[in-house]
Interface confidence: low
């Protein structure tokens, strides 16, 4: 269990993406962007990108930077899993992993993250704009979800490398140490931007919610910007998402996880299943639905699946105490 | 609207056994975790303990262990707490709650009452 | 196992007034969280990570602190804000409260 706050050391970049000069250039202003965007603040972390091999398949990357343990992760598409969505994938780390087509394979990559291959082929394929989110369910954090698309201007395969960002503590000393280095990153990016601003550049996805709730939504919330926080998604281009998918779903509970075999749901223990906390860096952006409750005039939350979440039984604080340890 | 109905009051003898019940409508009862809390007359709030609807997962305190038994029926969205081994100690509000980041509903408080 | 000191127990203040209480843990804990209970009713969690308001408590609340020592203040007091304050914490079990400040109008 960690008590403080950590900034993981940046990973190297992905095999294959170091060799590029220019690409450099261009992932570090999205790089520092992300940064500043997100540093402290989410919990959850998504990265979409497309496969440069199969143009319309798609990898989507996960992962939770909470402290406690998972008790089910939930990946969707065409919005939160409760606002329209629909469902790619569940994975239990005891119970197994189940998935509806057009998901290929899904898999537990670390304690704490998980990917899932999208088939590129058939009317259920996923169009570029598509939005997929991610939502962990954690004791004693709660639950927590990231959304993320490709950006429309991402060349196949050169999305940037997952950047390990800030993790939100419970102690504010360790993450006020980093806010001189983001504001220096922040106005550096600025400059960046000046200097560059004749490049066509890859745009964060602010379109993917009604206007009055920007993408800072993922920023912790204070009293002023709750009501962000609750602005139900805007409706986004339905025509990559498959009408039949929604009755797949396993309704009145977790039965089906009985017939999972046992053997498929072991997640990689030991001490470098908290090493690799990416988040996204180009072009997928990262929203954080807190507030799962119905206020007035608004929906109630509601998940698809039986067993879609284990929010916190402690309530507002993600990061306290030892809880979950596992 | 999120509700969570509470069973109506409870005399119990020392020594028994109360089951007490928490309806929940308005919000999908597998997603959340219920806690049940107690408040003594004139007292503070006490923490029981929690469950996850959706699997049954439990967390508790060490002083209920073995004594506070939480469970939940999906079918009717119900989660229940029965305290065995009664002592006039137990005689309080029994609270259930769920509760998310930034918003909580709690339930009306069942009333438990120990006497011989 | 924490244990949350709140002081006063009670107190009473005229509306307009401004009123402060506190919270004293044994010993340091991350965020605090306060909760209004009125007479006969159930609780409400009011403040959560120690400064944030739950969506509709009005603004003349505010908490702060940090470490051991923990407060909730309200900047003017009014009538509806007579109730009871615990405050909760989250960063071990027993997740205690506190003993409650009882707060009155004059």
């Known amino acids: 269990m960690r008590t403080e706050a950590q900034v993981p050391a940046l990973q190297p970049p992905e095999p294959g993406l170091e060799g590029a000069m220019g690409h450099r250039t261009l992932v570090l202003p999205w790089v520092l962007l992300t940064l500043c965007v997100t540093a402290g603040t989410p919990e959850v972390w998504v990265q979409v990108r497309m496969e440069a091999t199969e143009l319309s398949s798609f990898t989507i990357r996960c992962g939770f930077l909470g402290s406690g343990s998972i008790s089910l992760v939930t990946v969707s598409w065409g919005g939160p899993n409760g606002a329209g969505g629909t469902t790619l994938a569940v994975l239990h780390p005891e119970r197994g992993i189940r998935q509806w087509a057009p998901a290929r394979q899904a898999r537990w990559e670390t304690q704490s993250s998980i990917s899932l291959i999208l088939e590129g082929s058939g009317a259920s394929s996923p169009c570029a704009n598509t939005t997929f989110c991610c939502k962990f369910a954690s004791f004693p954090e709660g639950s927590w979800e990231a959304c993320g698309s490709l950006p429309p201007s991402s060349d196949p395969g050169l999305s940037a490398p997952p950047t390990p960002a800030p993790i939100l503590r419970a102690d504010l000393a360790g993450i006020l140490g980093v806010s001189g280095v983001l504001l220096f990153g922040c106005v550096y990016l600025l400059h960046l931007l000046r200097r560059h601003k004749h490049r066509p550049a890859p745009r964060l996805q602010p379109s993917r919610t009604s206007p009055q709730a920007p993408r800072a939504r993922a920023w912790a919330p204070s009293q002023a910007s709750q009501a962000a926080l609750h602005v139900p998604y805007a409706t986004i281009n339905t025509s990559c998402r498959p009408a039949t998918l929604d009755t797949a779903h396993p309704h009145g509970g977790p039965s089906w996880w009985a017939s999972l075999p046992t053997h498929a749901a072991h997640r990689p223990q030991g001490p470098a299943a908290w090493a690799s906390t990416p988040i996204p860096a180009r072009g997928s952006f990262v929203s954080v639905e807190n507030g799962l409750y119905a206020q007035a005039g608004e929906r109630p939350p509601h998940t698809g699946p039986g067993l879609t979440l284990f929010p916190d039984p402690r309530g507002p604080r993600a990061m306290e105490g030892p809880l979950g340890v596992r | 609207q999120v509700q969570l109905q509470q069973s109506g009051a409870e005399l119990a003898r020392p020594g028994a056994s109360v089951k007490m019940s928490c309806k929940a409508s308005?919000?999908?009862?597998?997603?959340?975790?219920m806690q049940w809390v107690k408040q003594r007359p004139g007292q503070g709030l006490e923490w029981i303990g929690a469950?996850?609807?959706?699997?049954?997962?439990?967390r508790d305190t060490q002083k209920f262990k073995g004594r506070a038994t939480l469970t939940a029926d999906r079918s009717s969205s119900t989660a229940y707490i029965q305290l065995s081994s009664l002592t006039s100690e137990d005689s309080a509000v029994y609270y259930c709650?769920?509760?998310?980041?930034?918003?909580?509903?709690w339930g009306q408080g069942t009333t438990l009452t120990v006497a011989s | 196992q924490i244990v949350l000191t709140q002081s006063p127990a009670i107190m009473s203040a005229s509306p307009g007034e401004k009123v402060t209480m506190t919270c004293s843990a044994s010993?340091?804990?991350?965020?605090m969280h306060w909760y209004q209970q009125k007479s006969g009713a159930s609780p409400k969690r009011w403040i959560y990570?120690?400064?944030k308001l739950t969506s509709g408590v009005p603004a003349r609340f505010s908490g702060s602190g940090s470490g051991t020592s923990y407060s909730l203040t309200i900047s003017n007091m009014e009538a509806e804000d007579a109730a009871t304050y615990y405050c909760?914490?989250?960063?071990?079990?027993?997740?205690?409260f506190g003993g409650g400040t009882k707060l009155e109008i004059k």
């Open positions: 469950i996850f609807p959706g699997n049954g997962e439990t």
């Open positions: 909760q914490q989250w960063i071990s079990n027993p997740y205690t």
């Open positions: 709650a769920t509760f998310n980041n930034y918003l909580d509903y």
């Open positions: 308005g919000y999908t009862f597998t997603d959340y975790w």
């Open positions: 010993s340091s804990v991350s965020y």
């Open positions: 990570d120690t400064s």
